[in-house]
Interface confidence: medium
């Protein structure tokens, strides 16, 4: 999931403490858009024909890597973050992580972090990455992340994990926005209208985005989420999530108004770009996926066939926080007043825009971002946003 937004509203002369985050875009409200929902949901759009197109009401996990050093360096930027509803709720994950070799049919190798550009977006996948059939993108849109579509389970319902980064991070803008045609093709006229046009489906290569010169992101882990809420009235599009990326970058004509990385250095230098899995089929109950995307450097082998999840802070198991020598805190914990405290506890608004904070053994903290309605919060701390209206 993108660890940064791609193209904010205009040049921000003042950093907003608590960048926007990601939520899913709304259903297309054309007359032909989407099947009727079972009942009116407060967050759904009513199509012109009276049909209700329900939003994606599930949660999207995106990684928030929090090695101690990383967190402490990032801490100054946390103080001013606006706590949104549900922010900072620390929870234990009722699931286990599968080892990479059990989940992926592709080689596991760390991607290179794409250079942070003014319109910094995430790295595109290569054609072999099973990416979603995104139609050709505007030439101005650098597609760098978000297009790692490894598989066909619905991404809006799935989380991603990002490992702590041990090296130097490149600055990334945190208030950019990517516009996407989330429901492009639902009207039968869009480029991805055919039922095969969802990630991992055959016969959609013609819609692949231009990945020239881009570095793919690699998914390492899938954590199948058995507790993500799912309402069968929700509509999961069968078309490509990336069918149209209206990347919110300013062009040469008005790039003086574009948000550049420099504006947000205090928040962004510490973020690691992540890959973005794809949407899944439009039928059946989705299985959420948790993708772990390593940063530029590997962190060694991933824990065995299952990764233990830390208990909710405050519950038994807090002793896991301290390391063997008693002087350092383990991933996801930070020393505070002489003891190791969960970042989820210490920083209630660690996850922006209503994201929930979780701790995963040997990985650290990550944020579970809300995905619903017309916008989709993404990023390691739910600090980025996708929208298509």
């Amino acid at each position: 999931v993108p660890a940064r937004e791609a193209g904010s509203a205009v040049e921000a002369e003042e950093l907003v403490k608590g960048s926007p985050a990601w939520e899913p875009p709304a259903n297309d409200t054309r007359e032909e858009a989407g099947p009727p929902a079972a009942g009116e949901d407060e967050a759904s759009w009513t199509a012109p024909g009276g049909e209700l197109a329900g939003p994606e009401e599930v949660l999207q996990e995106s990684a928030a890597v929090t090695g101690t050093a990383w967190l402490e360096a990032d801490s100054p930027g946390l103080g001013g973050v606006t706590a949104e509803a549900g922010s900072g709720d620390a929870q234990a994950l009722p699931a286990t992580l599968q080892a990479p070799h059990e989940v992926l049919g592709q080689s596991i190798m760390p991607p290179a972090i794409p250079e942070a550009t003014e319109a910094s977006g995430p790295p595109s996948p290569t054609p072999g990455d099973k990416l979603s059939p995104a139609s050709e993108l505007p030439k101005e849109s650098p597609l760098e992340v978000w297009l790692n579509l490894g598989g066909s389970t619905p991404d809006p319902q799935g989380p991603e994990l990002t490992y702590p980064f041990q090296g130097t991070l490149e600055p990334q803008p945190a208030s950019d926005i990517i516009d996407i045609d989330y429901f492009e093709g639902l009207d039968g006229e869009g480029r991805g209208a055919d039922l095969g046009s969802f990630p991992g489906s055959p016969g959609t290569s013609e819609n692949h985005p231009d990945t020239e010169g881009e570095t793919p992101s690699w998914s390492l882990l899938d954590l199948y989420d058995d507790f993500t809420p799912f309402d069968e009235s929700d509509f999961y599009p069968t078309t490509s999530f990336y069918d149209d990326l209206d990347e919110e970058e300013e062009e040469e004509e008005d790039d003086k108004d574009a948000v550049g990385g420099g504006d947000l250095e205090d928040e962004n230098e510490l973020l690691v770009p992540t890959g973005k899995p794809g949407l899944g089929p439009g039928t059946g109950q989705p299985t959420s996926r948790w993708h772990a995307v390593p940063p530029q450097h590997t962190l060694g082998s991933v824990p065995g066939s299952s990764i233990a999840l830390r208990p909710r802070p405050g519950e038994p198991g807090r002793d896991l926080a301290s390391s063997e020598n008693g002087t350092e805190c383990r991933s996801g914990f930070v020393r505070h007043n002489g003891s190791c405290r969960s970042v989820c506890d210490l920083f209630p608004s660690y996850c922006h825009n209503g994201g929930q904070c979780y701790l995963v053994e040997n990985i650290g903290a990550f944020c579970r971002c809300n995905t619903q309605d017309y916008i989709w919060h993404k990023g390691m701390r739910c600090e980025s946003i996708i929208t298509d209206f």
């Epitope: 193209g7 904010s8 509203a9 205009v10 921000a12 003042e14 907003v16 608590g18 960048s19 926007p20 875009p25 709304a26 297309d28 409200t29 054309r30 407060e42 967050a43 759904s44 759009w45 009513t46 606006t82 949104e84 509803a85 139609s135 505007p138 101005e140 849109s141 208030s175 926005i177 516009d179 996407i180 045609d181 989330y182 429901f183 492009e184 093709g185 006229e189 869009g190 480029r191 069918d243 149209d244 209206d246 990347e247 919110e248 970058e249 300013e250 062009e251 004509e253 008005d254 922006h352 825009n353 209503g354 619903q372 309605d373 017309y374 916008i375 946003i385 929208t387 298509d388 209206f389």
Partner: antibody, heavy 117, light 111 residues
């Protein structure tokens, strides 16, 4: 320089139709979602409709759904709003606006639509 | 009736600071950091002056600042100047439909 120029407004009888156009320049039109926002005389702003950069996704306010159709011709850098079954309450200045973040960073000068018998 | 509530008018003297409020609900203002503010002179198009609660576009004076607390977003104009006299509209992303809400607008009078 970004410029948005609306046209097509005028006086129309209730039940009639109008087609508004918005000519865009100074930016890569196809890369941005666009919206129509209206303002009734002496009133506040009201979001009317939006369309994604490719034109593949469209959105409407409930008050105009089924009567208005937003579209765009990226080859002409032009945004459209086809307004049918017009009502007196549709009387307003209609602005086209370029979306940026969850805000509108550029607006046209507006075109007045008067629905009256 | 507008979805977001703004005072119909506010006034202040040159040099003073004024604050315009914009009240919404948990599904819009309170729930997200996507409040924007527009300045509109009579007979003119709106101009974006604040987005994402507190960010200023380039070219907008730093006398304009935005904030948010709970259901209420605020626009503060410090060092009030005669040219600030205009209508000010707030807007917010809305989790319900429509996705974009506006306030009714506030007329600022510089005394």
């Amino acid at each position: 320089e970004v410029q948005l120029l609306e046209s097509g407004g005028g006086l129309v009888q209730p039940g009639g139709s109008l087609r508004l156009s918005c000519a865009a320049s100074g930016f890569t039109f196809s890369s941005y979602a666009m919206s129509w926002v209206r303002q009734a005389p002496g009133k506040g702003l009201e979001w009317v409709s939006a369309i994604s950069g490719s034109g593949g996704s469209t959105y409407y306010a409930d008050s105009v759904k089924g009567r208005f159709t937003i579209s765009r011709d990226n080859s002409k850098n032009t945004l459209y709003l086809q307004m049918n079954s017009l009502r007196a309450e549709d009387t307003a200045v209609y602005y086209c606006a370029k979306k940026r973040s969850l805000a509108f960073d550029y607006w046209g000068q507006g075109t007045l639509v008067t629905v009256s018998s | 009736q507008s979805a977001l509530t703004q005072p119909a008018s506010v006034s202040g003297s040159p040099g003073q600071s004024i604050t315009i409020s914009c009240t919404g609900t948990s599904t819009d203002v309170n729930g997200y950091n996507y409040v924007s503010w527009y300045q509109q002179y009579a007979g003119k198009a709106p101009k974006l002056i604040i987005f994402d609660v507190s960010k200023r576009p380039s070219g907008v004076s730093n006398r304009f600042s935005g904030s948010k607390s709970g259901d209420t977003a605020s626009l503060t104009i410090s060092g009030l100047q005669a040219e600030d006299e205009a209508d000010y509209h707030c807007s917010s992303y809305n989790r319900k439909r429509p996705p974009v809400l506006f306030g009714g607008g506030t007329k600022l009078t510089v005394l």
